[in-house]
Amino acid sequence: IVNGSDCQKDAQPWQGALLLGPNKLYCGAVLISPQWLLTAAHCRKPVFRIRLGHHSMSPVYESGQQMFQGIKSIPHPGYSHPGHSNDLMLIKMNRKIRDSHSVKPVEIACDCATEGTRCMVSGWGTTSSSHNNFPKVLQCLNITVLSEERCKNSYPGQIDKTMFCAGDEEGRDSCQGDSGGPVVCNGKLQGLVSWGDFPCAQRNRPGVYTNLCEFVKWIKDTMNSN
């Protein structure tokens, strides 16, 4: 997150981190039920760990943290690397969470976000993609949903209904390491960090997010059948 601020502790209890090895954070994730996470499909790895209820970037133990293994990763069937369409993936964890003030699921928005909606994006990603600086704690940033026209003008030929743009204030953006993390609008999960230009936070090159309202049925059906 570029030019965000430290999240209040436990204010994003649905925020998850996907880790390679003991502590290599490579993507964010979102808790949507006691045993299921959403993340970006491009975050798929054969083996990874899941950390919930953690505030710090460092591996230091925190009392609210809960660690899990992913036992099933189900990318959306319409996702195809290196494209960005349908960039979401369900992860089933090896057990259910212990519900606490630090770890709680978020409800997915059924209605699509409209232009001007204020949302919160969060993550432990780099705070400057040109220098790869990382925050000490989870970062939060208020962003604004942009019109479809403005989104398409920013990225001609690359935007479809499975995406929306948000941000566009120069110097404020999600960034590398934030992928798969939540965009929450009016208390509901509206999107996942997906892609954008490099480096992050450039004028007229907003962050692009997976448009979850288009996938509510697939998410529910997939969870029910697994």
Partner: antibody, heavy 127, light 107 residues
């Protein structure tokens, strides 16, 4: 301009250990990966392992597992590579190198290549 | 571990020649490939990252291409300072293995 400055040449006996340092001058380690690469005389490059100084997480090539330890001190922007149970075939030039760690257009966090290298440290293992 | 196979192991060429070096990964690595140049007694120098992105300060006669398992480094018009050994490295997963190297020699 960041430079990686390594410690001086070492001559070691078989069975002993060597610890090579790598200090970043004019910059920081934060948000980078520091890798160690060695090159035996007349041979190619061999990746030994790397460390994410921000988390202290180190990863090693299987070949060196149990024999190499990579550490980093963020406060002094110095990384260390210690290789134990030395044998003659460990005679090589040892390089540290810095890699930017990021995704590209997607916003996952991953690697680029190693854009800044140390000058190399010659380690000779001989009885 | 992912094996990286470079070919040819050496190539003789003249100034002005177009030189192509290939690198094959034993499994798909998307675009997570870097190319380095090394001169005798010197540390390697990064030329290309993410398979095709030119590192800052590297002459545009160097270019990289490929994705998945097959990659190419091309020097469009060889210059005297380009005679060196070139290595590919996959940075997709650990250990970050190198190819065996290609020595570009003067014909």
């Amino acid at each position: 301009q960041v430079q990686l400055v390594q410690s001086g040449a070492e001559v070691k006996k078989p069975g002993s250990s060597v610890k090579v340092s790598c200090k970043a001058s004019g910059g920081t380690f934060s948000g980078y990966v520091i890798s160690w690469v060695r090159q035996a005389p007349g041979q190619g490059l061999e990746w030994m392992g790397g460390i994410f100084p921000i988390s202290g997480y180190a990863v090693y090539a299987q070949k060196f597992q149990g024999r190499v330890t990579i550490t980093a001190d963020e406060s002094t922007s110095t990384a260390y590579m210690e290789l134990s149970s030395l044998r003659s075939e460990d005679t090589a030039v040892y390089y540290c190198a810095r890699a930017s760690a990021s995704g590209y257009y997607d916003r996952s966090y991953y690697y680029y290549g190693m854009d800044v290298w140390g000058q190399g440290t010659t380690v000779t293992v001989s009885s | 571990d992912i094996q990286m196979t470079q070919s040819p192991s050496s190539v003789s060429a003249s100034v002005g020649d177009r030189v192509t070096i290939t690198c094959r990964a034993s499994q798909g690595i998307s675009s997570w490939l870097a190319w380095y140049q090394q001169k005798p007694g010197k540390a390697p120098k990064l030329l290309i990252y993410a398979a095709s992105s030119l590192q800052s300060g590297v002459p545009s006669r160097f270019s990289g291409s490929g994705s998945g398992t097959d990659f190419t480094l091309t020097i469009s018009s060889l210059q005297p300072e380009d005679f060196a050994t070139y290595y590919c490295q996959q940075v997709s997963s650990f250990p970050q293995t190198f190819g065996g190297g290609t020595k570009v020699e003067i014909k």
